[in-house]
């Protein structure tokens, strides 16, 4: 018979032959042959593989480093990685939660809508027209543009969401 060019789901092609993939939680020891099945071995204590695979090495479980404020939220298994979270009152810097911050800052152009608490991180909002923020801050709101008119001045340079307006003297009409 013709050697296969494609294999079924949960199989892989090797030496013109379809072999079974190893199930999650197990790694490949040896490919199948005409006479033997694929040989797989369970991952070790601190290892995992989360897909049907032909990997010869399992992945190490993630380490939740207490020096970075991390703790284990969910212990890893042979089929799943460890999930880290931050100590109470701290917040993950990313979805992967690789490190912790007390709270995040709002970038220039954004103001703080709500200051962080033990359970929720800083909530930022874009500065609307007429307001600006030129700093990165975890507490400062957007500031209103300076009103040149109330100072008997005129706008020399328009404001943006990151910069205040620049006021200047009014041009005096020559007689």
């Amino acid at each position: 018979p013709e050697p296969p060019t494609a294999c079924r789901e949960k199989q892989y092609l090797i030496n013109s032959q379809c072999c079974s993939l190893c199930q999650p939680g197990q790694k490949l020891v040896s490919d199948c042959t005409e006479f033997t099945e694929t040989e797989c071995l369970p991952c070790g204590e601190s290892e995992f593989l989360d897909t049907w695979n032909r990997e010869t090495h399992c992945h190490q479980h993630k380490y939740c480093d207490p020096n970075l404020g991390l703790r284990v939220q969910q212990k890893g298994t042979s089929e799943t990685d460890t999930i880290c979270t931050c100590e109470e009152g701290w917040h993950c810097t990313s979805e992967a939660c690789e490190s912790c911050v007390l709270h995040r800052s709002c970038s220039p152009g954004f103001g703080v809508k709500q200051i962080a608490t033990g359970v929720s991180d800083t909530i930022c909002e874009p500065c609307p027209v007429g307001f600006f923020s030129n700093v990165s801050s975890a507490f400062e709101k957007c500031h209103p543009w300076t009103s040149c008119e109330t100072k008997d001045l005129v706008v020399q340079q328009a404001g943006t969401n990151k910069t205040d307006v620049v006021c200047g003297p009014q041009d005096r009409l020559r007689a």
């Epitope: 404020g69 701290w90 911050v101 007390l102 800052s105 700093v135 801050s137 975890a138 507490f139």
Partner: nanobody, 116 residues
């Protein structure tokens, strides 16, 4: 690597005052937003006060407004918290934290105990 060292804590009677200091070394201090946070025994972290990098803007938690004053001296790389009219509920370990607020920028804290 930045190091923050808090000092000035101690035992004080209700109604008394304390001035906490936070000395920063190993990193630029000027221009960075700074916070004082506290942790009472068996409680979570509470954000107490903050000061902008320029020193022009400040924030105070409602629980300390009118009693605490935050300030900074960039020439000395030091942050301060003047605490007046202290109450038993102000008892906590006080920490200063520097932008970007990562866990490894965390000092050892200074213990404030308000008790008669």
């Amino acid at each position: 690597e930045v190091q923050l060292l808090e000092s000035g804590g101690g035992l004080v009677q209700p109604g008394g005052s304390l001035r906490l200091s936070c000395a920063a070394s190993g990193s630029t201090f000027a221009g960075y937003e700074m916070w004082w946070v506290r942790q009472a025994p068996g409680k979570g972290l509470e954000r107490v006060s903050a000061i902008s990098g320029s020193g022009g803007s400040t924030y105070y938690a409602d629980s300390v407004k009118g009693r605490f004053t935050i300030s900074r001296d960039d020439s000395k790389n030091t942050l301060y918290l003047q605490m007046n009219s202290l109450r038993p509920e102000d008892t906590a370990v006080y920490y200063c934290v520097k932008d970007p607020y990562s866990f490894d920028y965390w000092g050892q804290g200074t213990l404030v105990t308000v008790s008669s």
